[in-house]
Every structure is written in C-alpha cells, then in structure tokens.
C-alpha cells in the first residue's frame, strides 16, 4: 500500500502547532499529518511521541492505576512514569499489576533485600546463603520487613 | 493480552451496505489506536481505516473514502466499520487490529493485536 492510498479526515481540534517533516518523518511531540506535509504537536497530557516518526496518531498517555504513585506526568514527549507504592512491587513477569511484598523471610531464612517498587524482599538461607526462589511462604517468621527508598522507577508505555 | 472478534461480514449485492463490528475483550483497548485491514483472496493485507484512541482522528484508503466510515465505542470496548456503495472489488477477508498507533501506509506500531477475520462477499 503507498502513502498515496491514504485519505485522512480529521475532526475540528483544539489549535495544534504544525512544522514540516524533515525527511517524512516528525520530531518527538509530533505526527504526520493527513497528506504527509505537516507535523501536528500531540496533545499536552493526553498523547505523546518519543523519537522521529511518521506515525498517524501520537501514543495515548499512560494513567496510573490505583496503587501505583505518579512519578512524573506525560508531556508531548515522554509517557507517564508510574511506580508501585510503598510496600508494592512489580515483577517483570506480571507488569500490569502491583503485588504486596512479603512481610518476612520464611523460617530459616534471613532478609538481605527490602521492598521496593520493583522487587520484593529477598531471602536467603541462613547456612548457605542460596536465595529463596519467592514463593509465598507458608508459614513467616516477625522478621518484618520496611518499604525501600524509592530509586528507579518503572515506565509503563501506552 | 487483547482479544479481538470480527462479525458482521456476509454476501451482499453491489451497491448494498454491511456493518462490521470488532468485539475486543482481555484488556480495554481504549489505549489503542484501531484499524480495519482486508485481504481479497490471492492478494496481500491492506490498510482499509484507522482512527485513533479517541476515535477523533480518521484515515482511509483512497479506495474507500466516501463509502466506509470507522467508529469506535470505548465504553463496550468495540470498533465498528460501516460500509455502504459496496463493489465486487471489496470482497475480501476484513480484519480488526489494535494498536499503539499506525504509520503513515498503515503498518501497525507497538504492541498491536489481529482478530481472526470476517469475510465480505460482494457478488450479484
């Protein structure tokens, strides 16, 4: 299919800043206009882009969900930056969802690591020092563990 | 993960009128920009319409502009694509897609998902 095929319409919308694209493609910020001539700024807030491009539509905005904190807030340019809160995590295995970190180390087990947004506490065996694999256990010691200082925090895109 | 199911697809006339609808289900896909692609048999997928997450911006194919609109409802999570002034030309396997954004052309961008496909006959 060729750029040609292409017939866009779009709706009245709020006053949008236009430039040219530089080699068809549009800054971060921006997307490529119904007829390719112009570059079209996304809308504060609502939608961004982040590199050179020559997208229909900029990137919806991310919101955070309940239990998540707003880090920073989505510009034309950057998504929204989401973290869990204090004494939640998020595991690269389920990123949709922030889990409760464990308030103790199993038996036999001592704390080494705490919670933080993007792990939970780590454990290791008094002997042998070998990590626990993460389960829950069964049965906790009150070895209790307190939320970590934030540090790096964990983008969700669009 | 997104699911996304065709229906609406059937044998019309030319000249008749046939609304596709695209049920998505898994995740909201208020996020994502959607489109309409279709593939006539012995011929590759081609961008049919898109608009985006907020369903204010619209692109067509030059070969469909004036005679399909797209439209999408966010609170039930479905795309809709009303097709009128059908032609033998349409006749095609129609398919919904979900994502990021599309480039200019139509590719999709970022994570996209793909319904299974409804078919559009178009024969006296």
């Known amino acids: 299919i060729t750029q040609q095929d292409l017939a866009p319409q779009q709706r009245a919308a709020p006053q949008q800043k236009r430039s040219s694209p530089s080699e068809g493609l549009c800054p971060p910020g921006h997307h490529i206009s119904e007829d390719g001539r112009d570059c079209i700024s996304c809308k504060y807030g609502q939608d961004y882009s982040t590199h050179w491009n020559d997208l229909l539509f900029c990137l919806r905005c991310t919101r955070c969900d309940s239990g998540e904190v707003e880090l920073s807030p989505c510009t034309t340019t950057r998504n929204t930056v989401c973290q869990c809160e204090e004494g939640t995590f998020r595991e690269e295995d389920s990123p949709e969802m922030c889990r409760k970190c464990r308030t103790g180390c199993p038996r036999g087990m001592v704390k080494v690591g705490d919670c933080t947004p993007w792990s939970d506490i780590e454990c290791v065996h008094k002997e042998s020092g070998t990590k626990h694999s993460g389960e829950v256990p069964a049965v906790e010691e009150t070895v209790t563990s307190s939320p970590g200082t934030p540090a790096s925090p964990c983008s969700l895109s669009g | 993960e997104v699911q996304l199911l065709e229906s609406g697809g059937g044998e019309v006339q030319p000249g008749g009128s046939l609304r596709l609808s695209c049920a998505a289900s898994g995740r909201t896909v208020s996020n994502y920009a959607m489109g309409w692609f279709r593939q006539a048999p012995g011929k590759d997928r081609e961008f049919v319409s898109a608009l985006n997450w907020g369903g204010d911006t619209t692109y067509y194919a030059e070969s469909v502009k004036g005679r399909f609109t797209i439209s999408r409802d966010n609170a039930k999570n479905t795309l809709y694509l009303q097709m009128s002034s059908l032609r033998a030309e349409d006749t095609a396997v129609y398919y919904c897609?979900?994502?990021?954004?599309?480039?200019?052309?139509?590719?999709?961008?970022?994570?996209?998902?793909w319904g299974q496909g409804t078919l559009v006959t178009v024969k006296p």
């Open positions: 897609a979900a994502a990021q954004s599309f480039r200019r052309g139509g590719a999709p961008y970022g994570d996209n998902y």
